[in-house]
């Protein structure tokens, strides 16, 4: 399987909220002995590979933000800890998972990574990740709503 990032760049005004999204693509084994560990973290375009460095999002580590479930289930992170930091990560039945960040500040700008670990017992873990950039802007040049740029082309979309 692979991870797709529908949008590679999110440009948002300060104070707005944004939902960063990843999607599982390809054949996903839904056997009882297969589970998925999904999480989010900040990173940099590192020397080893993009997303190899893991930094917290608003002081929450990838462990704090993880989603964990089998192939058929939807899941949410523990609400209390994440919501206190204006964050919520979620996953649906169709392979899409996301992190929502409320009340954006300039400090939220940077590279964000989603990580999916397919845990096939008796086999090694299979990791895939996706990367996207968030730019938070302030002042007269900032957009009124988040503008997202698809990964495939550079046509932008407004999201409210």
């Amino acid at each position: 399987f692979k991870v797709a990032t529908p949008y590679s760049l999110y440009v948002c005004p300060e104070g707005q909220q944004v939902t960063l999204t990843c999607r599982l693509l390809g054949p996903v084994d839904k056997g009882h002995d297969v589970t998925f560990y999904k999480t989010w973290y900040r990173s940099s375009r590192g020397e080893v590979q993009t997303c190899s460095e893991r930094r917290p999002i608003r002081n929450l580590t990838f462990q704090d933000l993880h989603l964990h479930h089998g192939g058929h289930q939807a899941a949410n992170t523990s609400h209390d800890l994440a919501q206190r930091h204006g964050l919520e990560s979620a996953s649906d039945h169709h392979g899409q998972f996301s992190i929502t960040m409320r009340n954006l500040t300039l400090l939220d700008s940077g590279l964000y990574c989603c990580l999916v670990v397919e845990i096939r017992h008796h086999h090694s873990e299979h990791r895939v990740h996706g990367a996207m950039e968030l730019q938070v802007q302030t002042g007269k040049d900032a957009p009124s709503n988040c503008v997202v740029y698809p990964s495939s082309s550079q046509d932008s979309e407004n999201i409210t």
């Epitope: 990838f62 017992h121 873990e125």
Partner: antibody
Framework: QVQLQESGPGLVKPSETLSLTCTVS????????WSWIRQPPGKGLEWIGY???????NYNPSLKSRVTISVDTSKSQFSLKLSSVTAADTAVYYC???????????WGQGTMVIVSS | EIVLTQSPATLSLSPGERATLSCRAS??????LAWYQQKPGQAPRLLIY???NRATGIPARFSGSGSGTDFTLTISSLEPEDFAVYYC?????????FGGGTKVEIK
């Protein structure tokens, strides 16, 4: 703050079964691998195997024929059974939490098990 | 199974000196390598995961580098509490395996 505590007999006779339990406190047993690791006196670390909170297991092939790891989520405990022990199984046995795509981030303090008649 | 070879077996240094520990894998482990510190009578403590990511609460003087088969743990300036045994561990393949350890002792 998640803490792990091993418990079980410190002395086991050769050919018998070693049984240990690890109690997880201060956090959920869900979402992680729960492993057993051992360390013979003065030697290095050896991974024995893990159980996933869902009950799926994975064992070190070198011990697979003798090892059983089980979980009781209602008690937040997981257990190790090692059959047909010999003096070579004398070691400090650790339980540990293993995070997917990461490492063993939380360890019990370890319990010494001596195999002797 | 993947064999991890650590060198040197013992490193004799003084507080304040720089320590460089090596871990070599028998085949590529990408960057899926962790480092642990173990003091006598204690359980190991996670220092680094994925070759260079410091675990929560680990001081900045500990840093990891490398990918593929060759990895390094560096302690930039040894503190008295850093004298211990250090182990590397791979997680690209099951069974998970550890190196034989490097003892960092006071010179």
């Amino acid at each position: 703050q998640v803490q792990l505590q091993e418990s079980g007999p410190g002395l086991v006779k050769p050919s018998e079964t070693l049984s240990l339990t690890c109690t997880v406190s201060g956090g959920s047993i869900s979402s992680y691998y729960w492993s057993w690791i051992r360390q013979p006196p003065g030697k290095g670390l050896e991974w024995i195997g893990y159980i996933y909170y869902s009950g799926s297991t994975n064992y070190n092939p070198s011990l697979k024929s003798r090892v059983t790891i089980s979980v009781d989520t209602s008690k937040s405990q997981f257990s190790l059974k090692l059959s047909s022990v010999t003096a070579a199984d004398t070691a400090v046995y650790y339980c540990a939490r293993d995070i997917p795509a990461s490492a063993f981030d939380i360890w019990g303090q370890g319990t010494m098990v001596i195999v002797s008649s | 199974e993947i064999v991890l070879t650590q060198s040197p077996a013992t490193l004799s240094l003084s507080p304040g000196e720089r320590a460089t520990l090596s871990c070599r894998a028998s085949q590529s482990v990408s960057y899926y390598l962790a480092w642990y510190q173990q003091k006598p009578g204690q359980a190991p403590r996670l220092l680094i995961y994925d070759a260079f990511n410091r675990a929560t609460g680990i001081p900045a003087r500990f840093s990891g580098s490398g990918s593929g088969t060759d990895f390094t743990l560096t302690i930039s300036s040894l503190e008295p509490e850093d004298f211990a045994v250090y182990y590397c561990q791979q997680r690209i393949n099951w069974p998970l395996t550890f190196g034989g350890g490097t003892k960092v002792e006071i010179k």
